[in-house]
């Protein structure tokens, strides 16, 4: 399975030597080192950390480690003019103000440069008006408000709870509904697990804790001022009015103590059903406006943040391949944090650091991988995946010709229950085989494999005896590699029990309380889950870089394509009359999927039988595997989303975090019954079926015998 070219370590010991070198104690030490001060993108502290990582990766033994800098649009609060929200009385007097900062956690009271909670890229403004509670501000929440309840958000300030979908989608939805401001808050129903104490006594969100985050709708563009191209020294920058994805209304986040004060006064309509109620002792009335006694009071936002072009720094390390140096396997994760980054990103960065150290140790002993491994510490992920996207834009020609795989390495943990993997179907078998070889860290699974505990705790909804592997969405640095460039990608981390913990993400996400102590005291005291994630991520990189034949199974793509085709067909069949009227047929898509399945099967047979000692044939077969993901890229991109070019997967138009299959068809069908011109709408469905069918067929043909 693994190559022994250019190595003095026997093949069967390659992977074992690499995995055995990974140590939990080192990950712990690295995490501590990375989390003592804030590392906000664009700050001196994060530049210094970049230089430290560059220096340490060199010491670990990488062939070269360079800084790649870009000048991108970032957003910061005004230090002398803080952001806040008030309740004002009829005379305009501020009778209540939200807090200006989170109470610092114990031991961090004297740390400087803790950025106060803010919504990055919010425009400035001081709107005042009546409040409307919009639940999670999802598409369906606004449908409920506008269509069923006949509540108009135009000219109102909306208050939405965090969770379920990416915050940028919430803001976009509010803008489209005509709101003039958005208040985001963390409801305990979503960010407070029952029976657990709040930080510092447990891992729950305290009432003064607030989630920071960007509110962009970039759709894969990277730096808002230089879409499609790197933000380098000679870049042409758009004016701010033409920038991609910026919100047009002020937005600000608050904690649940402050939210209580706003929501307890709400009047107007009662919530439509129990799914609109959180856990605060408030009526969750929708509004608009406050109840009886308080009906003359209004809400006023005071937002003074500024957008600034600022320099950011990626760290790019190279471990040159011995046999195929022009084939790149990339392991990347971000370095910038909102505050201390105890989980996001440094639990991931610490794992990457240890993986680099282990690879470096092997290299010092004379070993090299077959293919080149690139290691990346990305900057400005929190501001819209900017560091990774700018680097990929700068290196797109190399990447599209040489990129074998990208493994993402943000937060290693979001819980300590079981493994969570999202990846291309090409990597399913790699992940299955690898996890069968790794030991489970879980209590009650001593001596059992990771595959076994993962499958038991997170079973596949379709295939018994197999674990759940999810679709890639976005919201992290794999986006440009997978959705734009079509490089096979995957991510792995330890997660919570989704059955019992229905809160969104982890409670302290993007708050000041995301500290080293949070991880060391409550999530992973022995760092055994971090070590397991290091073994999974590192093991995937090792196999991708070192297997003689790339560990991709194209038959797994065939299986999911059929599943996705069935799903989108059943969605369309909710409109049987229109399908008949407008002659909508999925025959071409099912035919293409059938062809793909047959060709993939034959390719797999050839893959078993070909002469692996023939370097030309080996390279040819590997190239077919490498370029299969690329074959799903449509150079024209998806409608109105030119940087989302993958035809099989895209981030959901309603939730950036979620992956949608056959997104072009899905979006064309979405809410089609409300379209003013049904003929045009169904015409677009037909066009998207055509694009999908063509793409699947074209991808299948890349797997056919070359001549």
């Amino acid at each position: 399975k693994s190559s022994n070219e250019a190595t003095n370590i026997t093949p069967k010991h390659n992977m074992k030597a690499f995995l055995d070198e990974l140590k939990a104690e080192n990950i712990k030490k690295f995490l501590y080192n990375f989390t003592q001060i804030p590392h906000l993108a664009g700050t001196e502290q994060n530049f210094q950390l970049a230089k430290q990582i560059q220096s340490q990766w060199k010491e670990f033994g990488l062939d070269s480690v360079e800084l790649a800098h870009y000048d991108v649009l970032l957003s910061y609060p005004n230090k002398t003019h803080p952001n806040y929200i008030s309740i004002i009385n009829e005379d305009g007097n501020e009778i209540f103000n939200t807090s200006l900062f989170e109470p610092p956690p114990p031991g961090y009271e004297n740390v400087s440069d803790i950025v106060p909670p803010f919504s990055a890229f919010s425009p400035q403004g001081m709107p005042e008006g009546d409040l409307v509670y919009v639940n999670y501000a999802r598409t369906e929440d606004f449908f409920k408000l506008e269509r069923d309840m006949k509540i108009n958000c135009s000219g109102k300030i909306v208050i939405a709870r965090y969770g379920k979908v990416f915050r940028g989608n919430k803001v976009k939805n509010a803008q489209l509904a005509g709101a003039k401001g958005v208040i985001l808050y963390s409801d305990p129903a979503d960010y407070f697990a029952p029976g657990v104490k709040s930080y510092p006594d447990g891992w729950n969100l305290p009432g003064g804790g607030v989630q920071r985050g960007n509110i962009l709708n970039l759709n894969g563009a990277g730096d808002p001022l230089t879409p499609g191209y790197p933000a380098n020294e000679y870049a042409y920058r758009r004016g701010i009015a033409e920038a991609v994805g910026l919100p047009s209304i002020p937005v600000h986040p608050i904690g649940y103590y402050d939210a209580q004060k706003l929501l307890e006064k709400m009047g107007g309509s009662a919530p439509p059903d129990s799914s609109w109620r959180g856990s605060l002792k408030v009526p969750y009335n929708v509004g608009p406006g406050f109840t009886g006694n308080f009906s003359t009071q209004k809400v006023k936002m005071h937002i003074h943040s500024t957008n600034e072009v600022t320099r950011i720094y990626n760290v790019i390390g190279t471990l040159r391949g011995a046999v195929e140096p022009d084939r790149y396997v990339i392991l990347g994760g971000h370095r910038d944090s909102w505050v201390f980054g105890g989980i996001d990103p440094q639990s991931g960065a610490a794992v990457v650091h240890e993986i680099v150290r282990s690879f470096g140790t092997l290299k010092k002993e004379g070993w090299r991988p077959r293919r080149t491994i690139l290691f990346a510490s990305w900057d400005a992920e929190e501001f819209g995946l900017l560091g990774s996207t700018e680097w990929a834009e700068e290196n797109s020609r190399l990447l599209q010709e040489r990129g074998v795989a990208y493994i993402n390495a943000d937060s290693s943990i979001e819980g300590n229950y079981t493994l969570r993997v999202d990846c291309t179907p090409l990597m399913y078998s790699l992940v299955h085989n690898l996890t069968k070889e790794l030991k489970s860290p879980d209590e009650g699974f001593e001596g059992k494999s990771l595959y076994e505990s993962w499958t038991k705790k997170s079973p596949s909804p379709e295939f018994s005896g197999m674990p759940r592997i999810s679709k890639l969405g976005s919201g992290n640095d794999f986006e440009v590699f997978f959705q734009r460039l079509g490089i096979a990608s995957g991510r792995a981390r330890y997660t919570k029990n989704w059955e019992t913990n229905k809160f969104s993400g982890y409670p302290l996400y993007h708050s000041v309380y995301e500290t080293y102590e949070l991880v060391e005291k409550f999530y992973d005291p022995m760092f055994k889950y971090h070590l397991t994630v290091a073994q999974v991520r590192g093991g995937m990189v090792f196999e991708l870089a070192n297997s003689i034949v790339l560990p991709f199974d194209c038959r797994d793509y065939a299986v999911v394509l059929r599943k996705y085709a069935d799903k989108i067909y059943s969605i369309s069949m909710k409109h049987p009359q229109e399908m008949k009227t407008y002659s909508v047929s999925f025959d071409s898509l099912f035919s293409a999927v059938k062809n793909f399945t047959e060709i993939a099967s034959k390719f797999s047979e050839r893959l078993q039988d070909f002469d692996k000692s023939n370097p030309i044939v080996l390279r040819m077969m590997n190239d077919q595997l490498m370029f299969l993901e690329r074959a799903f890229i449509d150079p024209l991109g998806l409608p109105d989303r030119p940087f989302y070019r993958h035809v099989i997967y895209a981030p959901s138009s309603h939730n950036k975090y979620a992956g949608e299959s056959f997104p072009g068809i899905y979006d064309a069908l979405f809410d089609i019954e409300s379209k003013v011109d049904p003929s045009k709408a169904w015409g677009e469905v037909k066009r998207q079926i055509y694009v999908a069918a063509f793409t699947v067929q074209a991808a299948a043909e890349t797997l056919s015998e070359v001549a």
Epitope: I87, I95, F96, N97, S99, P103, P188, F192, G207, G208, Y256, Y257, Q260, K261, S274, R277, G278, S279, L280, K281, V282, P283, Y284, F294
Partner: antibody, heavy 120, light 112 residues
Framework: QVQLVQSGAEVKKPGASVKLSCKAS????????INWVRQTPEQGLEWMGG????????NYNENFKGRVTMTRDTSSSTAYMELSRLRSDDTAVYYC?????????????WGQGTTVTVSS | DVVMTQSPLSLPVTLGEPASISCRSS???????????LHWYQQKPGQSPRLLIY???NRFSGVPDRFSGSGSGTDFTLKISRVEAEDVGVYFC?????????FGQGTKLEIK
């Protein structure tokens, strides 16, 4: 740690007013409502009302409306309760208590109590 | 106003034995968000009341696990699995679902 320290005992004549104070420490004063509860052997514990230090909004028990006034001074983290037109049956121990907010929504911290005696 | 009725009003118990106090409300204490804001307070002789159990069954921090709460709707119970000498005092149930907040008359626990 959370602490509520109340002013000292008071002796008042019927018809007079009394103003009690409750100084809070160990937490962010504006986040938590302050309730006033009195205790008599006859009536047991009686909730008189509460104030939100953040915006000064008050919520009074109808039984005391017109006689009770609750205020706060955020600069000194102090809540006040004034009871006017005192009667002999207002003789009681008066407690301030912090409303615990989520997840409790119960009075999670109490002052030591102030004894008010109304006697001619 | 919501009337809270406790029974018994006096409860003599032998050390180490269990104790149970009942509390009934005149209307449902379920709030619109599904939570029930029924709490239990303990008042030791010469002291202020202190929170023991919140939202029916949740022990407040520092409260020994021999104390437990249960119930729903209008009927609630406080149990002490094994009474200790330090448990002597008056126990009040209270509701904060409806304004005005109201308390039970109190149950005096004493050692036999």
């Amino acid at each position: 740690q959370v602490q509520l320290v109340q002013s000292g005992a008071e002796v008042k004549k019927p018809g007079a007013s009394v103003k009690l104070s409750c100084k809070a420490s160990g937490y962010t004063f504006t986040y938590f409502d302050i309730n006033w509860v009195r205790q008599t052997p006859e009536q047991g514990l009686e909730w008189m009302g509460g104030i939100s230090p953040g915006d000064g909004n008050t919520n009074y028990n109808e039984n005391f409306k017109g006689r009770v006034t609750m205020t706060r001074d955020t600069s000194s983290s102090t809540a006040y309760m004034e009871l006017s037109r005192l009667r002999s049956d207002d003789t009681a121990v008066y407690y301030c208590a912090r409303d615990g907010n989520f997840p409790y929504y119960a009075m999670d911290s109490w002052g030591q109590g102030t004894t008010v005696t109304v006697s001619s | 106003d919501v009337v809270m009725t406790q029974s018994p009003l006096s409860l003599p118990v032998t050390l180490g034995e269990p104790a149970s106090i009942s509390c009934r409300s005149s209307q449902s204490l379920v709030y619109s968000n599904g939570n029930t804001y029924l709490h239990w307070y303990q008042q030791k002789p010469g002291q202020s009341p202190r929170l023991l159990i919140y939202k029916v069954s949740n022990r407040f921090s520092g409260v020994p696990d021999r104390f437990s709460g249960s119930g729903s709707g209008t009927d609630f119970t406080l149990k002490i699995s094994r009474v200790e000498a330090e448990d002597v005092g008056v126990y009040f149930c209270s509701q904060s679902t409806h304004v005005p907040y109201t308390f039970g008359q109190g149950t005096k626990l004493e050692i036999k």
